[in-house]
C-alpha cells in the first residue's frame, strides 16, 4: 500500500474539457491509499469535493466513500488514457445530490456501481446510459446499488422520486445486462410500471424498506432469471392473483415478504391459498396479519377461508356518520 502527494496532471469532465499530461500509470493520488497488487484505490472519509484526477491506470476497485462530492458531472471518470480496468466503483455516503448524464462514461469495464446513502435530488435520465438516444450502447453494469438515495423532503423536486429513478434505469435500454439492483430504503410508494420490463437479466432485486402498498401494476413476467426478490418492510396489504401467478411462473425465484402490514380480510383468501402451496416465499411461516384488529398477529398460513371475511358494505341510506 502506498500513498502519494500532488502531481501536475489533469483529467476532463468532458471530452473537450481542460486537461494536461496523462497521469503516471502507477501513481497514487494524495489522500488515497493504493494497492497495485489488489488493483484497489481507497480515498475514504477524506472530504474530497471532486473525484481525484490522477487515478492509477491499474485501478480495478475504487472506493470514494464518505466524501463531499455533491455533484458528478458528465465524464467525471473520463481520463486519457481511460480507466479501462475499473470494475467496481463505490461512491456511497459522499453527499452526492446531483448525478448528471454521462457521469460514468468511458468506463468500459464498470460492472458494479454503488451510489447508496447519497441524497440524490437530481439523477439524470442518462446517468447510466450516457446518451439521450432511444437505444444507447449497452452499459457494462451488472450490479447497481441504489439503497437510501432518497433526498430529504425539502430537497425533493416536483416530479416523483420514483419516476426520476425509473427514468434513469430504463433510458436507452442500456441496463439490459443488469443482474443485481438494490433500491432499498427509498420511500418508494410505487414501482413505475415499465421499469422491470427493461431489466430482463435481473437475478436479484431488493425493494425492501420502502412504502410499497401494492404490486397490482407491476409485472414480473419478464424476469425469468430472477432468483431473489426482497419486499420486506414495505406497506403491502395483499398480493392479488395476477402477481401470485407471475411469481409462481418464475422458475428460480425466492421471495421475501416479512414485515408487511397484511390485511387479513376476504381479499386475502387467494394469497393464503397460494402461500400454503408455494415454495417461492422464504420464511412464509413468519408472515402475520396486521389488520383488522381482531386478526392482528395471526399467522397467515394458519388461516382458513372462514377467518377471512369482509364487513358488508352498507347501502348509503343505512350508513351512519
Amino acid at each position: 500500500t502506498s500513498s502519494a502527494s500532488s502531481s501536475s496532471s489533469s483529467a476532463p469532465f468532458l471530452a473537450s474539457a481542460a486537461s494536461a499530461q496523462p497521469p503516471l500509470p502507477d501513481q497514487c493520488p494524495a489522500l488515497c491509499e493504493c494497492s497495485e497488487a489488489a488493483r484497489t484505490v481507497k480515498c475514504v472519509n477524506r472530504n474530497l469535493t471532486e473525484v481525484p484526477t490522477d487515478l492509477p491506470l491499474y485501478v480495478r476497485n475504487l472506493f470514494l466513500t464518505g466524501n463531499q462530492l455533491a455533484v458528478l458531472p458528465a465524464g467525471a471518470f473520463a481520463r486519457r488514457p481511460p480507466l479501462a480496468e475499473l470494475a467496481a466503483l463505490n461512491l456511497s455516503g459522499s453527499r452526492l445530490d446531483e448525478v448528471r448524464g454521462g457521469a460514468f462514461e468511458h468506463l468500459p469495464s464498470l460492472r458494479q456501481l454503488d451510489l447508496s446513502h447519497n441524497p440524490l435530488a437530481y439523477l439524470s435520465p442518462f446517468a447510466f446510459s450516457g446518451s439521450n438516444a432511444s437505444i444507447s450502447a449497452p452499459s457494462p453494469l451488472v450490479e447497481l446499488i441504489l439503497n437510501h438515495i432518497v433526498p430529504p423532503d425539502d430537497k425533493r423536486q416536483n416530479r416523483s422520486f420514483e419516476g426520476m429513478v425509473a427514468a434513469a434505469l430504463v433510458a436507452g435500454r442500456a441496463l439490459q445486462g443488469l443482474h443485481l439492483l438494490e433500491l432499498a430504503s427509498n420511500h418508494f410508494l410505487y414501482l413505475p410500471r415499465d421499469v422491470l420490463a427493461q431489466l430482463p437479466s435481473l437475478r436479484y432485486l431488493d425493494l425492501s424498506n420502502n412504502s410499497l402498498v401494492s404490486l397490482t401494476y407491476v409485472s414480473f413476467r419478464n424476469l425469468t432469471h430472477l432468483e431473489s426478490l426482497h419486499l420486506e418492510d414495505n406497506a403491502l396489504k395483499v398480493l392479488h392473483n395476477g402477481t401470485l401467478a407471475e411469481l409462481q411462473g418464475l422458475p428460480h425465484v425466492r421471495v421475501f415478504l416479512d414485515n408487511n402490514p397484511w390485511v387479513c380480510d376476504c381479499h386475502m383468501a387467494d394469497m393464503v391459498t397460494w402461500l400454503k402451496q408455494t415454495g417461492v416465499v422464504q420464511g412464509k411461516d413468519r408472515l402475520t396479519c396486521a389488520f383488522p384488529e381482531k386478526m392482528r398477529n395471526r399467522v397467515l398460513l394458519e388461516l382458513n377461508s372462514a377467518d377471512l371475511d369482509c364487513d358488508p358494505i352498507l347501502p348509503p341510506s343505512l350508513q351512519t356518520s
Epitope: 500532488s6 474539457a17 489522500l31 472530504n47 474530497l48 484526477t53 458531472p73 445530490d97 446531483e98 448528471r100
Partner: antibody, heavy 120, light 111 residues
Framework: EVQLVESGGGLVQPGGSLRLSCAAS????????MHWVRQAPGKGLEWVSY????????YYADTVKGRFTISRDNAKNSLYLQMNSLRDEDTAVYYC?????????????WGQGTTVTVSS | DIVLTQTPLSLSVTPGQPASISCRAS??????????LHWYLQKPGQPPQLLIK???NLESGVPDRFSGSGSGTDFTLKISRVEAEDVGVYYC?????????FGQGTKLEIK
C-alpha cells in the same frame, strides 16, 4: 481576516519560466480548493487552473495545459503556479482565489494580484 | 465551452436610480439542485469581489441593494439604488463544468 498575497511576477522573455506564489492567512488553508485566475491588460477575467484542498484534483484551461503546473503546500499555507514556455499572450495580472469546491464553489476571496509580462 | 454573454457592456446610471445587468449562458447552468452562476464586481484598481453566489444568494457583507435572479440560461443582477461606490466592472461566472468561464464584463459608471 482572510488574506491572499501573490508574488513572483515580473518580466520574462517568450519561452521563459516563472513561478508564482500565493501566501494564505486568516483561514484554514487546507480546507479550501484554490484557483489561479488571470486578467490581460484592459481585458476580462480568464480562469487558469484549480487544485483541490488535498491536492487530489488538478484542472487547467486549454490555453495553458502542458505548460503550467499548479501545486500547493498546506504546511506552508502556500499555493504555486509554475509557468513554463511562456508566450506573449500569457501577459496578465495573475490572481489566486479561494473556493470551497470546484463546481459547487465560487471565488469568495481574492488576492491583489501579481503582474506577469512576457516580452522580448 | 460555455459562453456567457453580458448586456449591456456599459451603462451610466444616476445615483439613486436602479440598474440591471443581464447574463445569458450558451447552455443551461442550472440543475434541480443547484444554480451554477455567480456575480462579481471589480472596482477600479482592485481584484474582483463576490457579490452573488448561485444566482440569487447575497454574499455576506454585500449591501442588500444588490440582488440576483434567474435560472437555466438567463440571469439578472439588479441594483435597486445605485451609489457612487458601485462603479466598476461586473462579471458573471459559471461553475457548471471545466473550463470555468466569465462573461465579458459590464462597466457601470455614475452620471
Amino acid at each position: 481576516e482572510v488574506q491572499l498575497v501573490e508574488s513572483g511576477g515580473g518580466l520574462v522573455q517568450p519561452g521563459g519560466s516563472l513561478r508564482l506564489s500565493c501566501a494564505a492567512s486568516g483561514f484554514t488553508f487546507s480546507n479550501f480548493g484554490m484557483h489561479w485566475v488571470r486578467q490581460a491588460p484592459g481585458k476580462g477575467l480568464e480562469w487558469v487552473s484549480y487544485i483541490s484542498s488535498g491536492s487530489t484534483s488538478f484542472y487547467y484551461a486549454d490555453t495553458v495545459k502542458g505548460r503550467f503546473t499548479i501545486s500547493r503546500d498546506n504546511a506552508k499555507n502556500s499555493l504555486y503556479l509554475q509557468m513554463n514556455s511562456l508566450r506573449d499572450e500569457d501577459t496578465a495580472v495573475y490572481y489566486c482565489a479561494r473556493t470551497n469546491s470546484l463546481l459547487r464553489g465560487f471565488f469568495d476571496a481574492w488576492g491583489q494580484g501579481t503582474t506577469v509580462t512576457v516580452s522580448s | 465551452d460555455i459562453v456567457l454573454t453580458q448586456t449591456p457592456l456599459s451603462l451610466s446610471v444616476t445615483p439613486g436610480q436602479p440598474a440591471s445587468i443581464s447574463c445569458r449562458a450558451s447552455q443551461s447552468v442550472s440543475s434541480s439542485s443547484y444554480t451554477y452562476l455567480h456575480w462579481y464586481l471589480q472596482k477600479p484598481g482592485q481584484p474582483p469581489q463576490l457579490l452573488i453566489k448561485s444566482a440569487s444568494n447575497l454574499e455576506s457583507g454585500v449591501p442588500d441593494r444588490f440582488s440576483g435572479s434567474g435560472s437555466g440560461t438567463d440571469f439578472t443582477l439588479k441594483i435597486s439604488r445605485v451609489e457612487a461606490e458601485d462603479v466598476g466592472v461586473y462579471y458573471c461566472q459559471h461553475s457548471w463544468e471545466i473550463p470555468l468561464t466569465f462573461g465579458q464584463g459590464t462597466k457601470l459608471e455614475i452620471k
